[in-house]
């Protein structure tokens, strides 16, 4: 059931979230550009089948459509999705020296965004139980798989962030 009006979310929280989404989108775009320029891996759609075989998951945001937004469920899915991407980004570690700093910053910015969401849920008395462990993360058997995985993870993350941004912008409207 929909929980509480969107107006129960402070404007300052929503603006902070929108900032953070834009920051992570920038980090993700930088990672995609470097993967394209360095390894000519420029088209995630060409790697979809490989993504299935590597077991790279998607994070749902099914509780967040603007028509029937469930506040607790939506924030929880946002947090769970960010938690998932933290694990996926961790699995990419060692992707290449050139990409390391960009990946490092992306990883921390995703973690900080997850913190912002959780902090707000806690203040609203709807904090989810702490997730004790990550689910099974993809294992990359080769450098190519890790780089291709990087393209797919960055692409999935960007899609997740686009939806997140739309939802947050909708909530921020008076």
């Amino acid at each position: 059931t929909p929980l509480g009006p969107a107006s129960s979310l402070p404007q300052s929280f929503l603006l902070k979230c929108l900032e953070q989404v834009r920051k992570i989108q920038g980090d993700g775009a930088a990672l995609q550009e470097k993967l394209c320029a360095t390894y000519k891996l420029c088209h995630p759609e060409e790697l979809v089948l490989l993504g299935h075989s590597l077991g790279i998951p998607w994070a749902p945001l099914s509780s967040c459509p603007s028509q029937a937004l469930q506040l607790a469920g939506c924030l929880s899915q946002l947090h769970s999705g960010l938690f998932l991407y933290q694990g996926l980004l961790q699995a990419l570690e060692g992707i290449s020296p050139e990409l390391g700093p960009t990946l490092d910053t992306l990883q921390l910015d995703v973690a900080d965004f997850a913190t912002t969401i959780w902090q707000q849920m806690e203040e609203l008395g709807m904090a989810p139980a702490l997730q004790p462990t990550q689910g099974a993360m993809p294992a990359f058997a080769s450098a190519f798989q890790r780089r291709a995985g990087g393209v797919l993870v960055a692409s999935h993350l960007q899609s997740f962030l686009e939806v997140s941004y739309r939802v947050l912008r909708h909530l921020a409207q008076p």
Partner: antibody, heavy 119, light 112 residues
Framework: QVQLVQSGAEVKKPGASVKVSCKAS????????MHWIRQAPGQGLEWIGY????????NYNQKFRDRATLTADTSTSTAYMELSSLRSEDTAVYYC????????????WGQGTLVTVSS | DIVMTQSPLSLPVTPGEPASISCRSS???????????LYWYLQKPGQSPQLLIY???NLASGVPDRFSSSGSGTDFTLKISRVEAEDVGVYYC?????????FGQGTKLEIK
């Protein structure tokens, strides 16, 4: 209220290792990253790295990547920083500081732990 | 790594007078999201650093409004409109645009 309490001063010989602890209270420990920063005598601040306790992921400043190890124990809300192969230049005050975004970043610091490396 | 450079390194000030500290970054800290990822910290004698300013121009909680900060993408200024005795210490600018986070060398403010 948020508090970060660090372990006491240490004196170590060159080549040895040191492990500094930072016990957090007043907030949900796994949710926030914990950063480590050091300050050599009369010098500025230098970022060592951070740990994300929720997934056990640590990231390091390239300068410390081979010698620093950051860990966290969520059951005791304690973060640890271990530095190996100590040399005299590692003599410094080591701080833990809670991460976050915007006005949350380094809004809370431990009191610092002085590590002296001397033969 | 982004290099942060502060000036002056020492700043003697008479109480009640204004003070100004400069900080320059080797790369623009202005992100495409419109936020400038520049912070100021103050370390009072014998204490841990404390947050003064976040995202270039925002005062942290509890910071007196005699402090202000402004700048462009690479050049920043921390101003104290009227220095008080409790303002003594070392002021550090820092960037958190990207890892590794980096700090300026510090500016020691002392009372004349």
């Amino acid at each position: 209220q948020v508090q970060l309490v660090q372990s006491g001063a240490e004196v170590k010989k060159p080549g040895a290792s040191v492990k500094v602890s930072c016990k957090a209270s007043g907030y949900t420990f796994p949710i926030y990253t914990m950063h480590w920063i050091r300050q050599a005598p009369g010098q500025g601040l230098e970022w060592i790295g951070y740990i994300n306790p929720s997934i056990g992921y640590a990231n390091y400043n390239q300068k410390f990547r081979d010698r620093a190890t950051l860990t966290a124990d969520t059951s005791t809300s304690t973060a640890y920083m271990e530095l190996s192969s100590l040399r005299s230049e590692d003599t410094a005050v080591y701080y833990c500081a809670r991460g976050g975004y915007g006005d949350s970043l380094f809004a809370y610091w431990g009191q610092g732990t002085l590590v002296t490396v001397s033969s | 790594d982004i290099v942060m450079t502060q000036s002056p390194l020492s700043l003697p000030v008479t109480p009640g007078e204004p003070a100004s500290i400069s900080c320059r970054s080797s790369k623009s800290l202005l992100h495409s999201n419109g936020i400038t990822y520049l912070y100021w910290y103050l370390q009072k004698p014998g204490q841990s650093p404390q947050l003064l300013i976040y995202q270039m121009s925002n005062l942290a909680s509890g910071v007196p409004d005699r402090f202000s900060s402004s700048g462009s993408g690479t050049d920043f200024t921390l101003k104290i409109s009227r220095v008080e005795a409790e303002d003594v210490g070392v002021y550090y600018c820092a960037q958190n645009l990207e890892l590794p986070y980096t700090f300026g060398q510090g500016t020691k403010l002392e009372i004349k």
